[in-house]
């Protein structure tokens, strides 16, 4: 035979082809061997012109020999050399996938390698490559984008040899905070529209709470816990109602003292109060705000005023909450009863945002003393809170 060649070489297979002998022959004897590989010999029919070599070792140089037989006669032997491909790593998998990180793992190829080339690409076309050492079987991807589809590929290297690439596809978690504990975390997850969101107290998925998030005022990220806007909701409620909360989160409502206690126990929070009346606006911000637990009767801490509404909350600092059926204020009379509301009354109030809507009688209405006094019921009021360090978190998120 003549013209011995190999084709379709892979890491474990190759196809031997030859030109047949001019004379008719009975058979061809094929043998192949490689370094550290025992010789394999096969006999095939005399009318065969190709033979599939299987179970080859990867990244190995083979010597292939063939001669013809006719009866006792043997032709001269022709020879060809070929090298099998480097085999690929196996079972590439992405695990521990988070919003910005993932762990790639794989099993090494059978052949020895000098390293691996890792390539990972996002749907927006961002490609990153990294070469890792020969003994590595995992690699942590960092600085990924949340909620993004990625294709990760790996190729084994051995000097100039490169294996075929294998790939896996994964999607990063869409949320920086899978269980946001407040509206600031919801916002940092990418939610920038004001409206209803589910937060998880202490990040515990069993402690879900539906809240209204204000994502626009002063950078957003605020949990609104009180809204007065039209007088449709009755705010002259008892202790139990104020502890639990009431109303429609999209309309007028009170979030609940138990919820406020749990939220403000998660860290340091700031309070913002937004007031609006006949086209005028004012606000107050307090950089320290917390509400104690039921044992303290939801004691208020509010410090560090700035704003345009005037510091009316300072008068209420350190006070327990009062309702008509649980009088904790320092007055002889029951402030909640006298002023038909509920608040952290003292004797009695400079702030009465849970007072009677539209009532301009002295101290009876929705009052913020240092803005509109006690004889004007304010049309719109919201109280809201967010972490005191929100600006820092926001900056870190933007840099990421």
């Amino acid at each position: 035979p003549s013209g011995l060649v190999t084709a379709n070489i892979t890491d474990s297979e190759a196809l031997a082809r030859w030109q047949p002998a001019i004379a008719t022959v009975d058979s061809y004897v094929i043998s192949y061997t490689g370094e550290k590989v025992p010789e394999i010999t096969r006999t095939v029919s005399g009318n065969t012109v190709e033979y599939a070599l299987t179970d080859l070792e990867p990244a190995t140089e083979y010597t292939l020999r063939i001669f013809a037989e006719k009866g006792p006669q043997k032709s001269s032997t022709i020879t060809a050399k070929f090298t099998t491909d480097l085999d690929s790593p196996r079972d590439l998998t992405a695990t521990e996938v988070q919003s910005e990180t993932a762990l790639l793992t794989w099993r090494p190829p059978r052949a020895s390698v000098t390293g691996y080339l890792l390539v990972y690409e996002s749907v927006d076309g961002t490609v990153k490559e990294v070469i890792v050492g020969p003994d590595t079987t995992s690699y942590s991807l960092a600085d990924l984008s949340p909620s993004t589809h990625y294709t990760a590929k790996i190729q084994a290297l051995n000097g100039p040899l490169r294996s075929n690439m294998i790939q896996t596809i994964f999607t990063t978690i869409g949320l920086l905070y899978p269980f946001p504990k407040d509206c600031s975390q919801a916002m940092l997850n990418g939610d920038t529209t004001s409206g209803l969101y589910t937060i998880y107290l202490n990040g515990d998925k069993a402690e879900a709470l539906e809240v209204f998030c204000d994502m626009t005022s002063d950078g957003g990220g605020w949990i609104v816990f009180l809204r007065r806007k039209n007088g449709r909701e009755n705010f002259y409620q008892n202790w139990k109602a104020y502890a639990a909360g009431f109303g429609d989160r999209r309309e007028e409502f009170w979030l609940g003292l138990d919820n406020l206690n749990k939220i403000t126990a998660q860290g340091q929070y700031e309070l913002r109060v937004d007031l609006r009346d006949h086209g005028e606006t004012a606000f107050a911000v307090y950089d320290k705000f917390s509400v104690g637990d039921a044992k303290t009767r939801y004691k208020l801490k509010v410090e560090g005023y700035s704003g345009t509404a005037g510091d009316s909350m300072a008068y209420h600092n350190g006070r327990s909450f009062s309702t008509f059926d649980k009088d904790t204020d320092s007055a002889i009379t029951n402030c909640a009863l006298s002023y038909k509301g509920a608040f952290w009354y003292r004797n009695c109030h400079r702030v009465n945002l849970m007072g009677r809507y539209g009532d301009n009688n002295h101290s009876q209405g929705v009052n913020w003393f240092h803005w509109k006094g006690h004889e004007h019921s304010i049309q719109f009021a919201e109280m809201k809170l967010r972490p005191s360090n929100f600006r820092n978190l926001e900056g870190r998120r933007k840099r990421a």
Epitope: D311, A314, S330, A331
Partner: antibody
């Protein structure tokens, strides 16, 4: 122990200026509003001026507005009253008083006072 | 400005008697009313804040009541050390104004 010590009083001619100081100790100074209250000889108490804990808001009685300026240095735990264009009717014992709150409210601690006499 | 009117201006009283001093505000002030005691040559001392709350260290014979515009300071049994001038003060709005004082002296 919470203590307020006034200084800077004295005899001054009408139209002249005087600066009163009040040194505070024993409490977190910037957490509380501070005030000046005066008492003319043989008369009752008259609130003169107040300043919020941060120093961001100031308050004055009409009788001293535009003539007196209240200020504070929280780093030095000190309160001041700059008195300009003094009149005979400003003659009084001037007390420095601590508030119970960060904004004007109730005076729970008083100094012993410093006497200002305006006379030619 | 809110005017504070105290009565009486002077109150000669024997030791052991009950003393009542009234204070009226010219406008509604909720419970934003404080009472001070001043002895001759001394600085005023806070007795009652928020109309009815006894300041720490003040004897329980002192009590306050009232809300809105009318307020009362009561000394249930006058002691020798209680002879002094008493002032009411509204903390409802600035300027914070004092009553003209009530002098309680020995009868």
């Amino acid at each position: 122990e919470v203590q307020l010590v006034e200084s800077g009083g004295g005899l001054v001619q009408p139209g002249r200026s005087l600066r009163l100081s009040c040194a505070a100790s024993g409490f977190t100074f910037d957490d509380y509003a501070m005030h000046w209250v005066r008492q003319a000889p043989g008369k009752g108490l008259e609130w003169v001026s107040g300043i919020s804990g941060s120093g961001g808001s100031t308050y004055y009685a009409d009788s001293v507005k535009y003539r007196f300026t209240i200020s504070r240095d929280n780093a030095k735990n000190s309160l001041y009253l700059q008195m300009n264009s003094l009149r005979a009717e400003d003659t009084a014992l001037y007390y420095c008083a601590k508030d119970i709150s960060a904004v004007p409210d109730t005076f729970d601690i008083w100094g012993q006072g410093t006497m200002v006499t305006v006379s030619s | 400005d809110i005017q504070m009117t105290q009565s009486p201006a002077s109150l000669p009283t024997p030791v052991g008697d009950r003393v009542t001093i009234t204070c009226r505000a010219s406008q509604y002030i909720q419970g934003f009313l404080n009472w001070y005691q001043q002895k001759p040559g001394k600085a005023p001392k806070l007795l009652i804040y928020d109309a009815s709350n006894l300041e720490t260290g003040v004897p329980s014979r002192f009590s306050g009541s009232g809300s809105g515009t009318d307020f009362t300071l009561t000394i249930s049994s006058l002691q020798p050390e209680d002879f002094a001038t008493y002032y009411c003060q509204q903390s409802y709005s600035t300027p914070q104004t004092f009553g003209q004082g009530t002098k309680v002296d020995i009868k």
